[in-house]
C-alpha cells in the first residue's frame, strides 16, 4: 500500500539566463528510495540519481543540470525554451511508483521573482 | 533470460592497459545499468564503477578515478571496462554485473558475468 | 565510504546446522543491504536484496533481517551446497561497497 505522498516547489518563476531548483520531497512513507528519475516536458530524461550508482545527468544536458540539492535539480543558464512540466519520478520498495510535477516559467524581465512554495499536487 | 559473457583472460604487463567486454545476450540494456567489481586472489569484492547504457555516463570508486573508463555500446549490448597503468596489484577477477533501473532498482546485481581473469606480471 | 564489517570472517558448521552470519554497517543504511553467495571459482550469486527480501529462486531455509546498521544472514538448516563465501554489500549510498565476507566451511 502507498502511503506516502510527494510535495513539490509547484509553480515556479525563474528569470532567463538564471538559475532554478527543482525540488520534491516524499514523506510518510519507509520506503526506500531507490531511484529518482528527472524528466522534461515532452518526457525525456533529465537526469537520474540511483541509491547505487550516483548521479547520472543525460549527456546534452550535462553543461546546464547539476545534480542536488539532495535529491533535488538545478537548472542554470535558464532560456525560454525550458518553461514547462517537470516531473520527479521516486521509484521506492516496497511502495513503488511516486510522480510529481512542477511548472516552471522563464520570464524575460530581469525583475522576475523566482519563487518557490511546496505544495501537495 | 539475460545472461552476460566476458571477454578471456588477459595477461599484460605492468604498465600497460586491459580491456574486457561483457556482452548481454538474450536482453537488451534499455532499462539496465551494469557495474563492473574485481576480486584479487583469496580477496573480497570491490566494486570498481558502473555505467548507465542508455545515458552513457559512468561513476567511479574514488580508488579507480582516472585510472578506469567505463563505456557501453547499446547497439551491441556490450559493456566495456578499460583499466590502465597496471600494476601486479590490479591481479584479479573482474565481474560485470546488471542492474535494474526505474522501478525495478530495489534490486541487486542479480545477473553476472562469468569472470575475466586479468594477470599484471613481467 | 561506508565500511561493512562481517563476522565472524569464516565458521565451522555440520549439516542441518543454524547459521548466523552478521554484517555491521559504520553508518546507518536503512535497510539498502543485500546479500550474495559465492562458491570457488564462481561469480557472486544475489540472495536477499533490501535486507529481508528473498531472490526469486532462491530457498525458503535463507533469510535475511535487520535495519540501520546491523544485520544477520540466517541459513535455518544448511546444506551441502551452501558451503561457501558471503558478502553483504549497501547499496544506499555511492559508491556501494561490500563486506569482506564470510566462509562457511564444513566441519
Known amino acids: 500500500m502507498m502511503t506516502g505522498t510527494i510535495e513539490t516547489t509547484g509553480n515556479i518563476s525563474a528569470k532567463k539566463g538564471g538559475s532554478v531548483i527543482l525540488q520534491c520531497h516524499l514523506s510518510s512513507t519507509m520506503a526506500q528510495v531507490t531511484q529518482v528519475n528527472w524528466e522534461q516536458h515532452d518526457h525525456s530524461l533529465l537526469a537520474i540519481r540511483n541509491a547505487e550508482l550516483g548521479w547520472h545527468i543525460y549527456p546534452a544536458f550535462k553543461d546546464r543540470v547539476a545534480p542536488g540539492p539532495g535529491l533535488g535539480l538545478t537548472l542554470q543558464s535558464l532560456t525560454m525554451n525550458d518553461t514547462g512540466e517537470y516531473f520527479c519520478t521516486y521509484h521506492t520498495y516496497p511502495d513503488g511508483t511516486y510522480r510529481g510535477r512542477i511548472f516552471l516559467e522563464v520570464l524575460e524581465s530581469s525583475v522576475a521573482e523566482h519563487s518557490a512554495r511546496f505544495q501537495i499536487p | 533470460q539475460v545472461q552476460l559473457v566476458q571477454s578471456g583472460a588477459e595477461v599484460k604487463k605492468p604498465g600497460s592497459s586491459v580491456k574486457v567486454s561483457c556482452k548481454a545476450s538474450?536482453?537488451?540494456?534499455?532499462?539496465?545499468?551494469i557495474s563492473w567489481v574485481r576480486q584479487a586472489p583469496g580477496q573480497g569484492l570491490e566494486w570498481m564503477g558502473g555505467i548507465i547504457p542508455i545515458f552513457g555516463t559512468a561513476n567511479y570508486a574514488q580508488k579507480f578515478q582516472g585510472r578506469v573508463t567505463i563505456t557501453a555500446d547499446e547497439s551491441t549490448s556490450t559493456a566495456y571496462m578499460e583499466l590502465s597503468s597496471l600494476r601486479s596489484e590490479d591481479t584479479a577477477v573482474y565481474y560485470c554485473?546488471?542492474?535494474?533501473?526505474?522501478?525495478?532498482?530495489?534490486?541487486?546485481?542479480?545477473?553476472w558475468g562469468q569472470g575475466t581473469t586479468v594477470t599484471v606480471s613481467s | 565510504d561506508i565500511q561493512m564489517t562481517q563476522s565472524p570472517s569464516s565458521l565451522s558448521a555440520s549439516v542441518g546446522d543454524r547459521v548466523t552470519i552478521t554484517c555491521r554497517a559504520s553508518?546507518?543504511?536503512?535497510?539498502?543491504l543485500n546479500w550474495y553467495q559465492q562458491k570457488p571459482g564462481k561469480a557472486p550469486k544475489l540472495l536477499i536484496y533490501?535486507?529481508?527480501s528473498l531472490q526469486s529462486g532462491v530457498p525458503s531455509r535463507f533469510s535475511g533481517s535487520g535495519s540501520g546498521t546491523d544485520f544477520t544472514l540466517t541459513i535455518s538448516s544448511l546444506q551441502p551446497e551452501d558451503f561457501a563465501t558471503y558478502y553483504c554489500?549497501?547499496?544506499?549510498?555511492?559508491?556501494?561497497?561490500f563486506g569482506g565476507g564470510t566462509k562457511v566451511e564444513i566441519k
Open positions: 553508518q546507518s543504511i536503512s535497510s539498502y
Open positions: 533490501a535486507a529481508s
Open positions: 554489500q549497501q547499496r544506499y549510498v555511492f559508491p556501494p561497497t
Open positions: 538474450g536482453g537488451t540494456f534499455s532499462s539496465y545499468a
Open positions: 554485473a546488471r542492474l535494474h533501473l526505474g522501478s525495478s532498482a530495489y534490486y541487486g546485481m542479480d545477473v
